[in-house]
Interface confidence: low
């Protein structure tokens, strides 16, 4: 029997425009088989990606895919930047494409920016 490979689905060059002060959930869509992988989020700082150890995360399960969620409660101005999720799964260390948060400070926002909810499917596969 073939082993099941973990797959992370984040759209290439995905972006989210969000408002400081609001709650926000950043989703890492994960497909896995026999064992759920250990998934972590990191924030890009130059060429390195700094693991977000102490941030609140959770899993959301749907029929054909799972989501590893990074919670922003609330969004802060310095949350602006690029994020990546990675899965450590036995024989694989898999990293997603980066996804960028554009944070608008509520003090300077004249109107609420639209959000890219990553609703378009299928996502581009990154393995």
């Amino acid at each position: 029997k073939e082993s099941c490979d973990v797959q992370l689905y984040i759209k290439r060059q995905s972006e989210h425009s969000i408002l400081a002060g609001d709650p926000f959930e950043l989703e890492c869509p994960v497909k896995y088989c026999a064992n759920r992988p250990h998934v972590t989020w990191c924030k890009l700082n130059g060429t390195t990606c700094v693991k977000l150890e102490d941030r609140q995360t959770s899993w959301k399960e749907e029929k054909n895919i799972s989501f590893f969620i990074l919670h922003f409660e609330p969004v802060l101005p310095n949350d602006n930047g690029s994020y990546r999720c990675s899965a450590n799964f036995q024989s694989n260390l898999i990293e997603s494409h980066s996804t960028t948060l554009y944070v608008t400070d509520v003090k300077s926002a004249s109107e609420r920016p639209s959000k890219d909810e990553m609703a378009s499917r299928p996502w581009l596969l990154y393995r």
């Epitope: 029997k1 073939e2 082993s3 099941c4 490979d5 896995y32 088989c33 026999a34 064992n35 759920r36 250990h38 972590t40 399960e61 029929k63 799972s66 450590n88 036995q90 024989s91 694989n92 260390l93």
Partner: antibody, heavy 118, light 111 residues
Framework: QVQFQQSGAELARPGASVKLSCKAS????????IQWVKQRPGQGLEWIGT????????RENQKFKGRATLTADKSSSTAYMQLSSLESDDSAVYYC???????????WGQGTLVTVSA | DIVLTQSPASLAVSLGQRATFSCRAS??????????INWFQQKPGQPPKLLIY???NQGSGVPARFSGSGSGTDFSLNIHPLEEDDTAMYFC?????????FGGGTKLEIK
Amino acid sequence: QVQFQQSGAELARPGASVKLSCKASGYTFTDFWIQWVKQRPGQGLEWIGTIYPGDGDTRENQKFKGRATLTADKSSSTAYMQLSSLESDDSAVYYCARGNGNSWFAYWGQGTLVTVSA
Amino acid sequence: DIVLTQSPASLAVSLGQRATFSCRASESVDDYGISFINWFQQKPGQPPKLLIYAASNQGSGVPARFSGSGSGTDFSLNIHPLEEDDTAMYFCLQSREIPYTFGGGTKLEIK
């Protein structure tokens, strides 16, 4: 083929520490999680924790939190478990194991017997 | 923590017959359409050997005599036909969530 060579039997006093080793061969050490499992004589199995040698990431059973320290040395392809503040209940065989694509526990070491006695 | 209860504690079955082992979880170990249960065989002085993963899939090199079934909280391992070499302890494991937990085991004796 995938193999693990675990260190030899240990005799330790209560309150002391032991450091067990698990030398891996036959695969890329940094690519696979290493699990540690405890088995008391004639009893069941208990998961202690796991380490990803690639970056040192660990997940631990809270029951062993603070007493079991998992580390890995990439240069020698060896995983270590240090168990501190030993008690008589820590007398057991300790196994290291590795997964494949389907289970976290597909390959096992031969085990190390730890005896805690005054 | 998820508690796994295995029954019976010991089992004596005649050569060539069927042995059935039960493993019951304190809560569902299903996730993403998969049952996160593994079955292991352990002989004296040896480490456990993986028999079944994801409740019903045979591990590498495991004979077709070994089969697993179940979902949610109730799982079983079947061996048929029994061979002399099957005398061992059998354990279930859940990997649905950390800490991973094992059942207490069932000892199989061939009559």
